[in-house]
């Protein structure tokens, strides 16, 4: 039996976390967003995250409670999507004590392309998903996951690596995006915001969700990650948005309850094996898919992104625990660890379901759907 996470058929209501925030603010992460015309006036003058007084000293803002059970992304209110910046501003900075190019952070300098040139690539992640522009692709079949229900032993390593919390997965977790598109799960990690500030990496029509889970997979065509980096389809990431709901998510609690043990950057602990699939939405048939990149340096491209249409519900307390427990570089809280959305540059996001079909009064004129390229072409 699956752990209770959300009711699957409720439409989106008006209480989604972050919905009332100005769009511009939702798109001001601590790093590479450049000011946009859509941002509220003066917002571009806000200091970067690391110039602010300690984020932990800001008053805690509890997200609104989620009355409806399940968010369906295609039902999100139509809003003007932020314009893609002409040039991605992939900012990070190195430690003063070292000149190593791998010393990147969210926020500050130098630009990420100096850390890794691939970060200036044309097909980067994350992106803003606009369901109306997605190409319905019937060839995209339900995802297949095998071996994701892990026994308590052996235990798994949970680590604060300074830019996320990462759970290392054992061998044997198999995932198929479709026939002949087979992968092995390697690790999962999360991205989040701060009190009252959403922190998902992908957005939907400019809407940023409270948090996002990424399960990273290596194609079975490759023996090691090094070989797969930058190769089309070499890596695949399953991504799901985390949203506030009325109940505690028991699957996530198995991880969140251990975060205090790894509050310090670089620390780790062992946690019992758990049902990894319970951390994902239950509907494996409805998703968006596109080719992009790693969202952190080295920003290698060729990554197949699969973003679930259904979201996962966590309680307000759990979302607060996620965003307010860990510490990162420079004695600062590990918060707002998301990259700005990157331009599509002609890419078409595919949908496994007719996400662009809209029967509501909001559709004033016919929508021209993009055409689908069959999966695997």
């Amino acid at each position: 039996q699956r752990l209770p996470r959300m009711q699957e058929d409720s439409p989106l209501g008006g209480g989604s976390s972050g919905e009332d925030d100005p769009l511009g603010e939702e798109d001001l992460p601590s790093e590479e967003d450049s000011p946009r015309e859509e941002d509220p006036p003066g917002e571009e003058d806000l200091p970067g995250e690391e110039d602010l007084p300690g984020e932990e000293d800001l008053p805690e803002v509890k997200p609104k409670s989620e009355e409806e059970g399940s968010l369906k992304l295609e039902d999100l209110p139509t809003v003007e999507a932020p314009g893609d910046p002409q040039e991605p501003q992939n900012n990070a900075h190195r430690d003063k004590e070292g000149d190593d190019q791998s010393h990147w952070r969210y926020g500050g300098d130098p630009p990420w392309p100096r850390v890794s040139p691939a970060c200036a690539g044309r097909f980067q992640s994350p992106v803003d998903i606009r369901p109306q522009l997605a190409a319905f692709c019937p060839a995209l079949r339900p995802l297949e996951l095998l071996g994701f229900q892990l026994p308590p032993l052996p235990e798994l390593r949970l680590r604060n690596n300074g830019h996320s919390v990462q759970l290392t997965l054992p061998p044997g977790l198999e995932m198929a995006l479709g026939p002949g598109r087979e992968y092995r799960a390697l690790q999962l990690h999360l991205h989040w915001g701060a009190a009252g500030r959403p922190g998902s990496e992908h957005t939907v029509e400019g809407h940023r969700f409270p948090a996002e889970i990424h399960v990273v997979h290596l194609s079975t065509a490759f023996a090691r990650v090094d070989e797969a980096l930058g190769r089309p389809g070499g890596l695949a990431v399953l991504a799901a948005f985390l949203e506030e709901g009325p109940e505690e998510n028991s699957a996530y609690e198995q991880l969140l309850s251990r975060l205090e043990e790894i509050a310090e950057e670089g620390s780790e602990t062992q946690v019992p094996g758990l049902d990894i699939s319970a951390l994902l939405p239950s509907d494996f048939s409805r998703y968006f898919q596109y080719e992009g990149s790693l969202t952190t340096p080295p920003c290698a491209q060729g990554v197949i992104w699969t973003v679930f249409n259904q979201t996962v519900m966590l309680s307000a307390k759990q979302l607060h625990t996620l965003s307010d427990t860990l510490w990162g570089p420079g004695d600062s809280r590990l918060q707002l660890n998301f990259r700005a959305t990157q331009p599509l540059n002609g890419r078409v996001i595919e949908a496994s379901f007719p996400a662009g079909v809209d029967s509501s009064p909001r559709a004033a004129e016919p929508v021209q759907l993009n055409s689908c390229l069959a999966a695997g072409d």
Epitope: D100, S102, N161, Q187, V216, R224, D226, G266, P297
Partner: nanobody, 114 residues
Framework: QVQLQESGGGLVQPGGSLRLSCTAS????????MGWYRQAPGKQRELVAT???????NYADSVKGRFTISRDNAAKTVSLQMNSLKPEDTAVYYC????????WGQGTQVTVSA
């Protein structure tokens, strides 16, 4: 798999020192969190020390003040300097590289005995 080659193990008297080294054949060494773990006979593998890509170190309580982990990104090497060794440090020491994937060396035996 990512090749991790450990060296430096051996037999040493209590109070003595050893330096373990691990060389990685990976183009993404700079992004890896490198670590040393150990497994004594009949026991589970346990953390000894780790060092992140930003050179943030983390040690097991039992080795703090005695062991020092360091990395040389240019040489793609992580080292573990072990001082004031005790009999209970006897184990097989494994090198680990973790980033997107998780990779292990074959291990090197460290024996602390008079």
């Amino acid at each position: 798999q990512v090749q991790l080659q450990e060296s430096g193990g051996g037999l040493v008297q209590p109070g003595g020192s050893l330096r373990l080294s691990c060389t990685a054949s990976t183009s993404s060494f700079n992004f890896q969190t490198m670590g040393w773990y150990r497994q004594a006979p009949g026991k589970q593998r346990e953390l000894v020390a780790t060092i992140t890509s930003r050179a943030i170190t983390n040690y097991a309580d039992s080795v703090k003040g005695r062991f020092t982990i360091s990395r040389d990104n240019a040489a793609k090497t992580v080292s573990l300097q072990m001082n004031s060794l005790k009999p209970e440090d006897t184990a097989v020491y494994y090198c680990n590289a973790a980033w997107i994937g998780d990779y292990w060396g074959q291990g090197t035996q460290v024996t602390v005995s008079a």
